[in-house]
Interface confidence: medium
Amino acid sequence: EAHKSEIAHRFKDLGEQHFKGLVLIAFSQYLQKCPYEEHIKLVQEVTDFAKTCVADENAENCDKSIHTLFGDKLCAIPKLRDNYGELADCCAKQEPERNECFLQHKDDNPNLPPFQRPEAEAMCTSFQENPTSFLGHYLHEVARRHPYFYAPELLYYAEKYNEVLTQCCTESDKAACLTPKLDAVKEKALVAAVRQRMKCSSMQRFGERAFKAWAVARMSQRFPNAEFAEITKLATDVTKINKECCHGDLLECADDRAELAKYMCENQATISSKLQACCDKPVLQKSQCLAEIEHDNIPADLPSIAADFVEDKEVCKNYAEAKDVFLGTFLYEYSRRHPDYSVSLLLRLAKKYEATLEKCCAEGDPPACYGTVLAEFQPLVEEPKNLVKTNCELYEKLGEYGFQNAVLVRYTQKAPQVSTPTLVEAARNLGRVGTKCCTLPEAQRLPCVEDYLSAILNRLCVLHEKTPVSEKVTKCCSGSLVERRPCFSALTVDETYVPKEFKAETFTFHSDICTLPDKEKQIKKQTALAELVKHKPKATEDQLKTVMGDFAQFVDKCCKAADKDNCFATEGPNLVARSKEALA
């Protein structure tokens, strides 16, 4: 229903704490370079204004849209052009073009230093002195680095952060308590960030219909006892919520997400038998719990999918009369029977089914033509199954770091033009799929692996789109979202690439590497590995193993030496010479 004052309506629905958090996230995602202090000042001004509108919805400016109010605030920032360049041009536009312009200027790879976690004692002190400010900084730092992070979910992670600090800061060994718990929150949040970016990419590039198809498949897997109309109601709501968040309408998005959770909990009987535990939780935890809910049990007596979609004499008539309903029902029926498939695979099968009907229903004997369609799914199903098998076997053999290196070599060979930092980031993330998915039961591996890889490859596409350098990457990224992962998997060594000159400074290291944390050490080594492959794209696995082994020994030896600097200075050139020789 329409409200006199949109901002008052959202403030009342969300409550002051969540309202302020969401406004802070919105501003941090739009203006990623502004310091926390500047954003928090704006947040307070917006909150005070919202309160005046709650008191009197007819007060001046209370009838303005939230985009107008937020945009006016952002455009009033002094020195906007100095700090943001052409983003300031957005301010000359009217809504809704102004908001669209802000969205287009979101930077997926902002030039910000990696978020450094303070030392445990210092962290606890600042948390205990001012928890609100501490958590505000967390929201700001995550949101500006991840401008598409799903805002209500980020509030949930801030709540988790709060819980961990509240618990651990009273312990005698604060670091021992904090480190593993905060690492776990960070890991989950980073995965959430790439998953949400994929959803926004889907929405931006392919529109609501494509996103709704994704949601239908996902909901059907989770809630196989819900009927199709229920599934499409949920899918429609989830599509609207994601569209709002991807579009910067964070208050509406969070409000609608809470509404959906309420609806699901009020209609458990027609959705799933697994919801009750989630429904007893407070709002942020409830929504998060529902988003992560385990699959309900598949009904025991489901008939063969062939009955309605292959054997029925009326297949072409049904398809012609109501294409969307017929294909939607096919996707629903197939997905509810296959929680063991990835959503990407289910969408590929639905696409194959549609293409088959398009072709066959125009022919003389349609049933003879589409009669084998389910058998034709087999190769499409086998391809990702083999991918999972071979990659999980490799992961089990090499461990996470070794597996990341294998992926890094593979992807540098596929797209050597891509910048080394981007390749290293992508390979490290792709390599984590082993730890994340390969330890799961067989039935959960495929959906875990493929849907995670798709999200990571989407990040690669988003970064590559900013500065396109590889035709092969552009080709895979331009196609349909569900075909991306198979497209990347099918890429081979880029034969058009002219190998990079061998630069000694790329492989010159200093004693500062010795004091780096393990993760940073790994990144240094992986950077060297990518550069090696760029120099010798056709180097064999054994050659690369030799050089990298040599390199690891060199670092280890010099870091143990009494005069580290001297060791690096003298042994370094020897290493470079040996490496060149080994790769000749």
Epitope: N225, E227, F228, A229, I231, T232, K233, T236, T270, P299, P303, A307, D308, F309, D312, E314, N318, A322, D324, V325, F326, G328, T329, F330, Y332, E333
Partner: nanobody
Framework: QVQLVESGGGLVQPGGSLRLSCAGP????????MGWYRQAPGKERELVAF???????NYNDAVQGRFTISRDNAKNTVYLQMNSLRAEDTAVYYC??????????WGQGTLVTVSS
């Protein structure tokens, strides 16, 4: 638009029985809630009964215990068995579903007249 076709209406004496049938595409009948509605002359259309894909049924209080809704997936048909009919059951009976992404689908209706 999806086609639903009702049959089985007619003239029957009070206390008598009739069985209405609604035929439609199998994929639709199996995956969606199917309902029977009725509209008596000069009155609003009202829900008589519905059946979910799971087999769960629901009835209007006025027909509870006298009418039974069922489905036969093999025949792609939904039935409404009407027993102990009364004069106030006289109406045009419509089969209905609401497939997602589409407007409601209604049949053309079948007339049931209860009179002595």
């Amino acid at each position: 638009q999806v086609q639903l076709v009702e049959s089985g209406g007619g003239l029957v004496q009070p206390g008598g029985s009739l069985r209405l049938s609604c035929a439609g595409p199998g994929f639709l009948l199996r995956s969606n809630t199917m309902g029977w509605y009725r509209q008596a002359p000069g009155k609003e259309r009202e829900l008589v009964a519905f059946i979910r894909p799971s087999g769960l049924t629901n009835y209007n209080d006025a027909v509870q215990g006298r009418f039974t809704i069922s489905r036969d997936n093999a025949k792609n048909t939904v039935y409404l068995q009407m027993n102990s009919l009364r004069a106030e059951d006289t109406a045009v009976y419509y089969c209905h579903t609401r497939p997602p992404f589409q407007r409601d689908s209604w049949g053309q209706g079948t007339l049931v007249t209860v009179s002595s």
